[in-house]
Interface confidence: low
C-alpha cells in the first residue's frame, strides 16, 4: 500500500476502561498530532477508518460495527463502545485518509474489571485537598459526552466501599463532592457512579479518583533549615571524613519545585576542584511535607578545606534561604612534657 | 500517645456470642478506622473487619459476614466487635488496631483479647 | 483476595548476621499499600514498616523494606538478639485486608 505517515503506537495515552460500561475515545490525531481538527479534515473529504488488533495477536482487523444493538460504532472521531467486553483489549488504530494524503496513530486500550468495591487495575488520577481548609469539591471527571444534557443522570458517590450518606464532613451535590473540611481521614479512593438510560437500556460509568489530603497553603512556610544551625561545630583534622548533612523542611505547597543545594566558598560543588560528594534522601510527611537532605562529603579533609565556608541553600515558591555550617580544624592536645612543662617555666 | 484498651478474657460456649471492646485514649478517635484481627492458638494473624467511627459505617472479610458486627461510640471513644454462633474454632486472641488514616497501616494495637470457646 | 506468601516458614541465623525475609503477592499491590509487623511471643503485632519501604517512627534503621508490585522484601541488617520473632507482611490497598504466613526469625 502506498506510503502513510505513521506516528506509531502513543503509549503516553494508554487508555483504560471499565467491562461493561459505555467508552468513548477521540482519535488522537487530531489532539495531539495534526494541526488540524476532524471537521476541517471531514470538510476536505478526508475519510477515519478504524481498525485494531487484539491482545497477542500481530493481525490488524477491521473493527465490526455491524454487530447486535450496535455495540460499536463510530462517530466523528470518537470511537463508542456501548458496551465494553474484556476481549476488546488490543491496540487501535485511526488512519485519515484520501487518493493523495495518510496519517495514523495506534494507541493502547485496555478494558479492566472491577470489583464490587471498584477495587481494579486503573491507574487512578489524584485530586489535592488542602488540610481543614474550609469546603473543597471533586467532580465526577470524564463523563462529558455520554449522554446529552436533556438526560439527567443520577449519581451515587461512594468511599471506598462505602456509598456516602450521613457522612460528617462529605456532601454528595450531583457531580459534585463536597468536603466541608478535609482532614487526614478523608484520603482514599472516591468512586462516582453515573447511571443514564439510553435508547431503552441503562448504563453506568464509574469514575474513581484518589483524594489526598496536603498542607494547606495557610499554613505554609518558606523553608526551613534544621541542619547545619548554630548548635553544630563540625570540628575535625586533616585526613579525615567531613560529613555535613543539609536538612531542610519544605511546606507542601502545590505545584512548587524545592530545592537544596550546597555551595564551597560561594561556588557549586562541581564548579571547585576538590574531591566532595552529595548525597540526597527525601521523605514525605502524610500530609505531602517534604524534608529534604542533602549530604556533603568529603573523604579526606585538608586544613586549606577546613578553613572554606560551606552553605547550605533552600528554595521554594515561599521563599529562599541559606546556612552556613560551623567548620573548624581540631586543635590537636598539648603534650604535657613539652607545652605545659615550658608554660610552668622549666628549661 | 494514643493507646488502646481492649477489656477482658472471655470463655464462651458454642453457639453463643462474644462482644469485645476497644477504648481509645490519649488521641483523636473519630477520623481514624478502627480495624479488628484475629489470631488463632499458634496461628497467623486474619483480619475480620473494620470501622471509622466518623463515617459510622462498617465492612467485614467475607468470611465472617452475617456473624460478626462492629459498631463504634463516638461519646466514649470505643469500638466494639461483636462475633456471634460461636464455635472451637472462633478460640483466638482478638485484637484491635487503629488504621493510620482511611487506608494506612496498623500502627496502634490494643493489647488483645483472649476469647475462648469451649463447651 | 490478594494472598500474600511469605518465605522461608523458619529463618535460623545468629545475632549480627543479615535477615531476609520475602512477601509475594498473588496479585499487584494497590498504590504499594504494604505493611511488615514484628510479633514477639505473648505480644502484639508491632508495626515496622508501612508503605513498602517507610519506617514506622521508632522503628531502628536496620530494619528496611523493598519491593513493588508483587515482590517485596524486609531486610534485617544486622540482627540483635531482640529481633528474633515472627514477621508478617500485610496488604492494605484492597479489601479483604490480608497478611502473609508468617516468617519465624530464630536463634541458630
Known amino acids: 500500500s502506498e506510503r502513510c505517515d505513521d506516528w506509531g503506537l502513543d503509549t503516553m495515552r494508554q487508555i483504560q476502561v471499565f467491562e461493561d460500561e459505555p467508552a468513548r475515545i477521540k482519535c488522537p490525531l487530531f489532539e495531539h498530532f495534526l494541526k488540524f481538527n476532524y471537521s476541517t479534515a471531514h470538510s476536505a473529504g478526508l475519510t477515519l477508518i478504524w481498525y485494531w488488533t487484539r491482545q497477542d495477536r500481530d493481525l490488524e482487523e477491521p473493527i465490526n460495527f455491524r454487530l447486535p444493538e450496535n455495540r460499536i460504532s463510530k462517530e466523528k472521531d470518537v470511537l463508542w463502545f456501548r458496551p465494553t467486553l474484556l476481549n476488546d483489549t488490543g491496540n487501535y488504530t485511526c488512519m485519515l485518509r484520501n487518493t493523495t494524503y495518510c496519517s495514523k496513530v495506534a494507541f493502547p486500550l485496555e478494558v479492566v474489571q472491577k470489583d464490587s468495591c471498584f477495587n481494579s487495575p486503573m491507574k487512578l488520577p489524584v485530586h489535592k485537598l488542602y488540610i481543614e481548609y474550609g469546603i473543597q469539591r471533586i467532580t465526577c471527571p470524564n463523563v462529558d459526552g455520554y449522554f446529552p444534557s436533556s438526560v439527567k443522570p443520577t449519581i451515587t458517590w461512594y468511599m471506598g466501599c462505602y456509598k456516602i450518606q450521613n457522612f460528617n464532613n462529605v456532601i454528595p451535590e450531583g457531580m459534585n463532592l463536597s468536603f466541608l473540611i478535609a482532614l487526614i481521614s478523608n484520603n482514599g479512593n472516591y468512586t462516582c457512579v453515573v447511571t443514564y438510560p439510553e435508547n431503552g437500556r441503562t448504563f453506568h460509568l464509574t469514575r474513581t479518583l484518589t483524594v489526598k489530603v496536603v498542607g494547606s497553603p495557610k499554613n505554609a512556610v518558606p523553608p526551613v533549615i534544621h541542619s547545619p544551625n548554630d548548635h553544630v561545630v563540625y570540628e575535625k583534622e586533616p585526613g579525615e571524613e567531613l560529613l555535613i548533612p543539609c536538612t531542610v523542611y519544605f511546606s507542601f505547597l502545590m505545584d512548587s519545585r524545592n530545592e537544596v543545594w550546597w555551595t564551597i566558598d560561594g561556588k557549586k560543588p562541581d564548579d571547585i576542584t576538590i574531591d566532595v560528594t552529595i548525597n540526597e534522601s527525601i521523605s514525605h510527611s502524610r500530609t505531602e511535607d517534604e524534608t529534604r537532605t542533602q549530604i556533603l562529603s568529603i573523604k579526606k579533609v585538608t586544613s586549606e578545606d577546613l578553613k572554606r565556608s560551606y552553605v547550605c541553600h533552600a528554595r521554594s515558591a515561599k521563599g529562599e534561604v541559606a546556612k552556613a555550617a560551623k567548620v573548624k580544624q581540631k586543635v590537636p592536645a598539648p603534650r604535657y612534657t613539652v607545652e605545659l612543662a615550658c608554660g610552668f617555666g622549666a628549661t | 500517645q494514643v493507646q488502646l484498651l481492649q477489656s477482658g478474657a472471655e470463655v464462651k460456649k458454642p453457639g453463643s456470642s462474644v462482644k469485645v471492646s476497644c477504648k481509645a485514649s490519649?488521641?483523636?478517635?473519630?477520623?481514624?478506622?478502627i480495624d479488628w484481627v484475629r489470631q488463632a492458638p499458634g496461628q497467623g494473624l486474619e483480619w475480620m473487619g473494620g470501622i471509622i467511627p466518623i463515617f459510622g459505617t462498617a465492612n467485614s472479610a467475607q468470611k465472617f459476614q452475617g456473624r460478626v458486627t462492629i459498631t463504634a461510640d463516638k461519646s466514649t471513644n470505643t469500638a466494639y466487635m461483636e462475633l456471634s454462633s460461636l464455635r472451637s474454632e472462633d478460640t483466638a486472641v482478638y485484637y484491635c488496631?487503629?488504621?493510620?488514616?482511611?487506608?494506612?497501616?496498623?500502627?496502634?494495637w490494643g493489647q488483645g483479647t483472649m476469647v475462648t470457646v469451649s463447651s | 483476595e490478594i494472598v500474600l506468601t511469605q518465605s522461608p516458614g523458619t529463618l535460623s541465623l545468629s545475632p549480627g548476621e543479615r535477615a531476609t525475609l520475602s512477601c509475594r503477592a498473588s496479585?499487584?499491590?494497590?498504590?504499594?499499600?504494604l505493611a511488615w509487623f514484628q510479633q514477639r511471643p505473648g505480644q502484639a503485632p508491632r508495626l515496622l514498616i508501612y508503605g513498602v519501604s517507610r519506617r514506622a517512627t521508632g522503628i531502628p534503621d536496620r530494619f528496611s523494606g523493598s519491593g513493588s508490585g508483587t515482590d517485596f522484601t524486609l531486610t534485617i541488617s544486622r540482627l540483635e538478639p531482640e529481633d528474633f520473632a515472627v514477621y508478617y507482611c500485610q496488604q492494605y490497598g484492597s479489601s479483604p485486608l490480608t497478611f502473609g504466613g508468617g516468617t519465624k526469625v530464630e536463634i541458630k
Open positions: 496479585q499487584s499491590v494497590s498504590s504499594n499499600y
Open positions: 490519649g488521641g483523636t478517635f473519630n477520623i481514624y478506622a
Open positions: 488496631a487503629r488504621n493510620g488514616a482511611t487506608s494506612d497501616a496498623f500502627d496502634i
